[in-house]
């Protein structure tokens, strides 16, 4: 069974069949006698109940509100109500691009590494019984493939495979022909073999501080997905209640590597925090790299060359 429509905000393209399925469907079958209602509100209109008489394009089934097809004026908020259960969706219907086989705003992007397994399968489980045929297009040119029910590409990726792949399902409903398009933007990238992780900035950092104040030591690295970055301080991490490792933030770079940042926060700096090493380490299968921070009292700054300071 097709899963329910749990996303509260949905964007669809005009002219395609579309459906909303509420998420208490199993419950609805248990209470067949319960009144179940669908409503729409948009702009000035407040909660107009929907039924097949309100539009020839709308069909209501047990758990589903169907549009044959969805049009621009279907934009708005939709509600399903049953006893104490309410589910709400915000539907945004966008204009179809008449000059292309797909609409740019409805594209799913995927990155595939060169020589890695690459697959596109054209499937649509909800409408599958109504689909007559399915075609797969690359950059809006039809690909000649064996299976015209579920066309599929399975291969090791090459740079030439980059492009926009559109699955177009053709289906009949009440004597009319409809189509549903799903487009993938496939980008082929260089082999993302592991890099040697690197900590950013100088290996030794003297940080000027004042007693009783707080300081944040930021450790950043460029690393692989499975590498780790962590702080080491004192005999046992966690023994000093004034020292906190903040949550690591990790963001993917366009090349498929990771930029990681981990902050060590020292609150209410005391004498015991001065002139000791706070080490940040990045560890990978290929070994470790460490950078060190030393807190120095501001008054003692004159004894250390200016270029070794960080703020």
């Amino acid at each position: 069974a097709e899963s329910c429509t749990s996303r509260p905000h949905i964007t669809v393209v005009e002219g395609e069949p579309f459906y909303l399925k509420h998420c208490s469907c199993s419950l609805a079958h248990e209470i067949e006698t319960t009144t179940k209602s669908w409503y729409k509100s948009s702009g000035s209109q407040e909660h107009v109940e929907l039924n097949p008489r309100s539009s020839s394009r709308i069909a209501l089934h047990d758990c589903v509100l169907e549009f044959w097809p969805v049009e621009l004026n279907d934009t708005g908020s939709y509600f399903f109500q049953m006893k104490n259960y309410t589910q709400k969706w915000k539907l945004n219907v966008i204009r179809r691009n008449k000059h292309s086989c797909f609409t740019e705003r409805q594209v799913t992007s995927k990155i595939v590494e060169v020589k890695k397994f690459f697959q596109i399968t054209c499937e649509n489980s909800y409408y599958q019984t109504l689909v007559n045929s399915t075609s797969l297009y690359k950059n809006c040119k039809k690909l000649l493939l064996e299976n015209n029910k579920n066309p599929t590409i399975k291969k090791n990726a090459e740079f030439e495979d980059q492009g926009y792949y559109s699955c177009v399902h053709f289906l009949h409903h009440n004597g009319k022909l409809f189509n549903i398009t799903k487009t993938f933007n496939i980008t082929i990238v260089e082999d993302r073999s592991n890099i040697v992780p690197v900590l950013l900035g100088p290996k030794l950092n003297h940080v000027a501080v004042e007693l009783g104040k707080n300081v944040r030591l930021n450790c950043s690295a460029l690393l692989n997905e499975e590498d780790v970055i962590y702080w080491m301080f004192g005999e046992e991490n966690g023994s000093d209640p004034n020292i906190h490792e903040e949550k690591e933030m990790r963001i993917m770079t366009p090349e498929g590597k990771w930029h990681a940042s981990k902050v060590l926060r020292i609150e209410n700096i005391g004498e015991s925090n001065l002139n000791v090493l706070y080490n940040c380490t990045v560890a990978s299968t290929g070994g470790t790299d460490t950078k060190s921070f030393i807190l120095v009292r501001k008054a003692d700054m004159a004894d250390i060359p200016g270029h070794v300071f960080t703020r």
Epitope: E226, Y230, N237, G238, K247, M249, R250
Partner: antibody, heavy 128, light 107 residues
Amino acid sequence: QVQLVQSGAEVKKPGASVKVSCKASGYTFNSYGISWVRQAPGQGLEWMGWIRTYNGNTNYAQKLQGRVTMTTDTSTSTAYMELRSLRSDDTAVYYCARDEARIVVAGTTPYYYGMDVWGQGTTVTVSS
Amino acid sequence: AIQMTQSPSSLSASVGDRVTITCRASQDIRNDLGWYQQKPGKAPKLLIYAASSLQSGVPSRFSGSGSGTDFTLTISSLQPEDFATYYCLQDYNYPRTFGQGTKVEIK
């Protein structure tokens, strides 16, 4: 898929020791820490401690200090929690959980790795 | 150790109700707080991290707010599958500490 599978139920006598295992699969074991949490019958959750799988560092709850030891075997992707000098109030379900304070942003939805995947639990009964 | 106090310890509610659970820390923990859901005989499940961030895959009817010492978990429209026990957890420092739990029961 990512999962943690724990060893089976144990019945122990007071004063004995128990060692619970937690085998990880579906992810790189030594890229994430492991926390141990227990729950006495009808009670709430109690954090026991945490081990960094990648360097062996540990943090233990004060009340268990000296009685608990957490270790890992990276060759088998398994974490262990040993509790010694067992008492009747150690009767509980013991859980392991993948635990790394890491927020990862790839695409639109961030994902947090703090106690995001749990084992099924191991019941330890201490009774004379 | 930081003490986490949850309230109420239990509450009764109906499907569709808006439910609010609060958690108070004995000291400032910034936004280092998570919320977990546990059903009988099952392991806990992470719902919210960093006080207000929804964990990937968790329904949007769950939301968290607060910082410092006072935090709130809200379920905007209670669903049948939401009847469970909810725990807050501070991950500001060690030892980590859980609240004592809030049991959400069917009215």
